[in-house]
């Protein structure tokens, strides 16, 4: 025999049940909301801090590079590699052909003011890329010099000088007083390196690491 | 649209779906309970109404012969 | 955790929550429907069972006196 409930108790029971169910609903919705907020706000802050970092990084370069050309590296939207707008990019570096005629030291100083160095050529592929942008009737300083005149060639960025990865014209280098290297075109040998006097004004090639933001 | 943007859009859709379904589920649950009570009252005690079985998150309508 | 990873994790949580709740909702709905049919059969047609009202996404148990 099931004892008969009073309508009042039934009402009360229903009220409690409703309360429990709606409480569960509220808790569930709150949890959902918390999750959703975390997913929206945390990344937003994450993005914001990342953007702030990017902006401050960009500000560093803005003095000399008012505009950058950026490409997305890989699939992640966070990774952008940039080169200053008139510069060209190859692998992980940016290149700039300076058409002003200056001495080797002044050319190197100019590059360094832009956050770069005179070009250091590490591979044949790199040289092949660079020469696509050069004029055959001009000579361009490289970041290679022998200040002591003892044939101890050195790259401006302290990269070790590797005799096996050099592209000297035949018979070059040939003069102990000619302590700076240029890249130029000779009809017999195409593009190659030559040693010349450092004070003689030439065009030049600057190279810098890509800017990652 | 980029990959992350798509993810956020999907988040929003799933979030809204979750809220709507939570509300619907709770509403149905309460209506089932109410209906059982109403049914109990209207049939003059023919049914004992809903009984919770092992505190499950869902309930079934239980039908018994009322005590004679 | 990175920004996209967090989004994907939340997606998974919301997706699971949606699936579980959908299953529970459907289960409850089926049980309500079954209970109504059972109730109708057992009470010799005392009740007409569940009636759909305006094609709503939820249903209530409707109790009417059977036609005499």
């Amino acid at each position: 025999m099931v004892p008969e409930e009073e309508p009042q108790d039934r009402e009360k029971g229903l009220w409690w049940f409703q309360l429990k169910v709606w409480s569960m609903a509220v808790v569930s919705i709150l949890l959902l909301s918390v999750c959703f907020t975390v997913s929206s706000v945390v990344p937003h802050n994450f993005m914001y801090s990342k953007t702030v970092k990017r902006l401050s990084k960009l500000r560093e370069y803005q003095q000399y590079h008012p505009s950058l050309t950026c490409v997305m590296e890989g699939k992640d939207i966070e990774d952008w590699s940039c080169c200053p707008t008139p510069w060209t990019s190859f692998q992980s570096s940016c290149y700039f052909i300076s058409t002003g005629m200056q001495s080797w030291t002044k050319s190197q100083k100019n590059c360094s003011v832009m956050g770069a160095d005179l070009v250091v050529i590490n591979t044949r592929e790199e040289q092949d890329f660079i020469i696509q942008n050069l004029k055959r009737n001009s000579s361009y300083f490289l970041g290679l010099s022998d200040p002591g005149g003892r044939r101890h060639w050195q790259w401006v960025d302290q990269t070790p000088y590797n005799e096996n990865v050099t592209f000297w014209h035949s018979g070059e280098p040939n003069n102990l007083d000619e302590r700076c290297a240029i890249i130029n075109f000779r009809s017999s040998e195409e593009w190659g390196w030559n040693d010349i006097h450092c004070h003689v004004p030439q065009k030049s090639i600057c190279k810098m690491k890509k800017i990652y933001i | 649209l980029g990959e992350p943007q798509l993810c956020y859009i999907l988040d929003a859709i799933l979030f809204l779906y979750g809220i709507v379904l939570t509300l619907l589920y709770c509403r149905l649950k309460i209506q089932v309970r109410k209906a059982a009570i109403t049914s109990y009252e209207k049939s003059d005690g023919v049914y004992t109404g809903l009984s919770t079985r092992n505190q499950e998150t869902y309930e079934t309508l239980k039908h018994e012969k009322p005590p004679q | 955790l990175g920004e996209p990873q967090l989004c994907y994790i939340l997606d998974a949580i919301l997706f699971l929550y949606g699936i579980v709740l959908t299953l529970l909702y459907c289960r409850l709905k089926i049980q309500v429907r079954k209970a109504a049919i059972t109730s109708y059969e057992k009470s010799d047609g005392v009740y007409t069972g569940l009636s759909t009202r305006n094609q709503e996404t939820y249903e209530t148990l409707k109790h009417e006196k059977p036609p005499q």
């Epitope: 200056q102 001495s103 080797w104 030291t105 002044k106 190197q108 100083k109 010099s145 200040p147 002591g148 005149g149 040939n174 003069n175 102990l176 007083d177 000619e178 302590r179 700076c180 010349i196 006097h197 450092c198 004070h199 003689v200 004004p201 | - | -």
Partner: antibody, heavy 121, light 111 residues
Framework: EVQLVESGGGLVKPGGSLRLSCAAS????????MSWVRQAPGKGLEWVST????????YYPDSVKGRFTISRDNAKNSLYLQMNSLRAEDTAVYYC??????????????WGQGTTVTVSS | EIVLTQSPATLSLSPGERATLSCRAS??????????MHWYQQKPGQAPRLLIY???NLESGIPARFSGSGSETDFTLTISRLEPEDFAVYFC?????????FGGGTKVEIK
């Protein structure tokens, strides 16, 4: 002992020409870059031209470019300066100087006694 | 071109005194550790004579009372104790880039 001896200076009318010579001795002439430097009366020193040791490069300031030509004969240990279209402002003592490279630049470690060029009508 | 400005134009001193001559370049004539400024002495009717190269290196045969210092744009030639034969005109010169240029000279005369 290093010695540089200039010759060929003199009086010349504006528009005229002169060829200066510098005879070198006491060092391996062919191994050094050489320059001509001039000094107008009561004035400072002014570089006029440079030729590299291997005769591969010659340089001039704008003031003489196109008018002066530097050359060398390593077999004769001699340096030359051909001066055409002379002007009054070219009047000066002309020195021949040996260049020594130091790091990325050079200095003049030995100078001749000079030869005087006067351009006047 | 790089302009070299020497000061003072004339320095009147007595033998035994210390002489300090200045040469200022319109732009840097240094590169890393290389300071590419040189000093010459010229006596009336004579050719210039090299004293100091690379800002501070004493040319062989030059007395140790001569010394040079400086970097970037400011360079100094110092004669610690003036001897009678030191009264002459002194020129500074740069050749870090063409054209090589000379300062206007500082005349050191007997007071």
């Amino acid at each position: 002992e290093v010695q540089l001896v200039e010759s060929g200076g003199g009086l010349v009318k504006p528009g005229g020409s002169l060829r200066l010579s510098c005879a070198a001795s006491g060092f391996t002439f062919s191994s050094y870059g050489m320059s001509w430097v001039r000094q107008a009366p009561g004035k400072g020193l002014e570089w006029v031209s440079t030729i590299s040791s291997g005769d591969s490069y010659t340089y001039y300031p704008d003031s003489v470019k196109g008018r002066f030509t530097i050359s060398r004969d390593n077999a004769k240990n001699s340096l030359y300066l051909q001066m055409n279209s002379l002007r009054a402002e070219d009047t000066a003592v002309y020195y021949c100087a040996r260049q020594i490279y130091y790091d990325y630049a050079y200095y003049f470690d030995f100078w001749g006694q000079g030869t005087t060029v006067t351009v006047s009508s | 071109e790089i302009v070299l400005t020497q000061s003072p134009a004339t320095l009147s001193l007595s033998p035994g005194e210390r002489a300090t001559l200045s040469c200022r370049a319109s732009e840097s004539v240094s590169f890393r550790t290389s300071h590419l400024m040189h000093w010459y002495q010229q006596k009336p009717g004579q050719a210039p004579r090299l004293l100091i190269y690379g800002a501070s290196n004493l040319e062989s045969g030059i007395p140790a009372r001569f010394s040079g210092s400086g970097s970037e744009t400011d360079f100094t030639l110092t004669i610690s104790r003036l001897e009678p034969e030191d009264f002459a005109v002194y020129f500074c010169q740069q050749s870090i880039e063409d054209p090589p240029t000379f300062g206007g000279g500082t005349k050191v005369e007997i007071k």
